[in-house]
């Protein structure tokens, strides 16, 4: 008889999850020489150990520490790019500007990007049927806790001038409840981070508003300034330029600025 399985509101674990994580790890370590020492089987074991056999609404940041330790990586100063509600464009940017890095350009972020996973209490099985939804079920689920953990670490290790890409088409350009607003902003280290520069990306072709004057940006400026980090904001009006460069990655002048 099939075991009774908890029904959650969210979609289940991504199919072929273990194989995907392992394959991504191998690919990443092949492409990034500085991570060649990483043993991908150990990485998978640590990843699995964070959520397998555990009640999926009771996951802690502590559960992910062995994985975080294995995936330790540093970004050069001035090269960290955070983002909020504009992931695809941020990734297009770092695809071209290869010396800047989002969390998903780092090993752990790369492994988990766009994946869902959870297990069940007291069984070694992965739940492919359903996983807890952050709103409807619980916030301490395996996926949410993972991103909170690695986002915190990513922000803590940033140094120099940190950039953040924000979506100017949203009603809340800066959202205190986003991962950026609730985790990363509060974990930038004032002794290491000189400044946060926000890039507000405009959507409309004819848009010529100054979105750096938006009340939510003023709120972000206030939070950052209180943490003794300087704040700058720039309006960015032509996001289609990112894709034009991505389409022609062989064009070295796209990569270097000019």
């Amino acid at each position: 008889l099939p075991r009774w399985r908890q029904q959650w509101s969210g979609s289940g674990t991504t199919s072929r999850f273990p194989e995907t994580v392992l394959a991504r790890c191998v690919k990443y370590t092949e492409v990034h020489p500085e991570m060649r020492h990483v043993d991908c089987q150990s990485v998978w074991d640590a990843f699995k150990g964070a959520f397998i056999s555990k009640y999926p609404c009771n996951i802690t940041e502590e559960d992910y520490q062995p994985l975080v330790k294995l995936g330790t990586q540093t970004v050069p100063c001035n090269k960290t790019l955070l983002w909020s509600r504009i992931k695809d464009l941020a990734h297009q940017f770092t695809q071209v500007q290869r010396d800047m890095f989002t969390l998903e350009d780092m090993l752990l972020g790369y492994l988990a990007d766009d994946l869902t996973w959870c297990g069940e209490f007291n069984t070694f099985e992965i739940n492919y049927q359903s996983c807890p939804d952050w709103r409807k079920d619980c916030s301490n689920n395996p996926v949410s806790v993972f991103w909170k953990t690695v986002s915190r670490r990513f922000a803590e290790t940033a140094c120099g001038v940190v950039h953040v890409m924000l979506n100017g088409s949203r009603s809340k350009i800066f959202d205190k409840n986003s991962t950026f607003g609730s985790v990363e902003v509060h974990n930038l280290q004032p002794e290491k981070v000189q400044a946060l520069e926000a890039w507000v990306i405009h959507g409309g072709r004819e848009d010529s508003r100054d979105l750096c004057q938006d009340p939510t940006i003023k709120e972000l400026e206030s939070i950052i300034s209180k943490r003794n980090i300087r704040f700058f904001c720039k309006n960015i009006y032509r996001p289609d330029k990112f894709l034009q460069c991505v389409k022609n990655p062989e064009d070295s002048s796209c990569l270097s600025g000019i």
Partner: antibody
Framework: QVQLVESGGGLVQPGGSLRLSCAAS????????MNWVRQAPGKGLEWVSG????????YYADSVKGRFTISRDNSKNTLYLQMNSLRAEDTAVYYC?????????????WGQGTLVTVSS | DIELTQPPSVSVAPGQTARISCSGD??????VYWYQQKPGQAPVLVIY???KRPSGIPERFSGSNSGNTATLTISGTQAEDEADYYC??????????FGGGTKVEIK
């Protein structure tokens, strides 16, 4: 290396038309916004028009809107400016300029310019 | 539309520092670009993104942008720096604007 060479300038009567061309080489033409910037004799720089790489987006300064048309042929690596209903105040050296990539909107490279004189 | 205001001329002794200002409403919210133009020649980009120097531009050229004013600084000016300098910004849509230009004279 990047090269931009303008052509098509000359003397034209008020109300007349002229088509400027800019031949580009040394970079992937379709990756970049391209622009026309002009400079009247003894005056400063004035942006005239810009076009995206694909080329779905075009932009015009108010002073030329409805009279000038920017276009490009990516297969020929060539930028164009069709100028109609020309006025004396359109007299200037017209420069073709390549935009900077990504978050920057300035001009990395300029041609040597072509002179347009509108006079009767 | 933003309007960029530059002083018509700046005079400086050789080896001294020349500072050219460019002012406009909330200019700090926009990237600023600086061009050098010598008589009979096309403009040359000397600073982009407020403070970045293109390859081939001497280190004596630097830029900053805060409040309502962007500044181009030429440290240890040389005779070859005598030229017109233009600031430029982009504020979306069809609002790409240049300042009126500043003539730098080496005394």
């Amino acid at each position: 290396q990047v090269q931009l060479v303008e052509s098509g300038g000359g003397l034209v009567q008020p109300g007349g038309s002229l088509r400027l061309s800019c031949a580009a080489s040394g970079f992937t033409f379709s990756s970049y916004y391209m622009n026309w910037v002009r400079q009247a004799p003894g005056k400063g720089l004035e942006w005239v028009s810009g076009i995206s790489g694909d080329p779905s987006n075009t932009y015009y300064a108010d002073s030329v809107k409805g009279r000038f048309t920017i276009s490009r042929d990516n297969s020929k690596n060539t930028l164009y400016l069709q100028m109609n209903s020309l006025r004396a105040e359109d007299t200037a050296v017209y420069y073709c300029a390549r935009d900077l990539p990504l978050v920057y909107t300035g001009f990395a490279y300029w041609g040597q310019g072509t002179l347009v004189t509108v006079s009767s | 539309d933003i309007e960029l205001t530059q002083p018509p001329s700046v005079s400086v002794a050789p080896g001294q520092t020349a500072r050219i200002s460019c002012s406009g409403d909330n200019l700090r919210h926009y990237y600023v670009y600086w061009y050098q133009q010598k008589p009979g020649q096309a403009p040359v980009l000397v600073i982009y993104g407020d403070s970045k120097r293109p390859s081939g531009i001497p280190e004596r050229f630097s830029g900053s942008n805060s409040g309502n004013t962007a500044t181009l600084t030429i440290s240890g000016t040389q005779a070859e720096d005598e030229a017109d300098y233009y600031c430029q910004t982009y504020t979306g849509g069809a609002s790409l604007v240049f300042g009126g230009g500043t003539k730098v004279e080496i005394k």
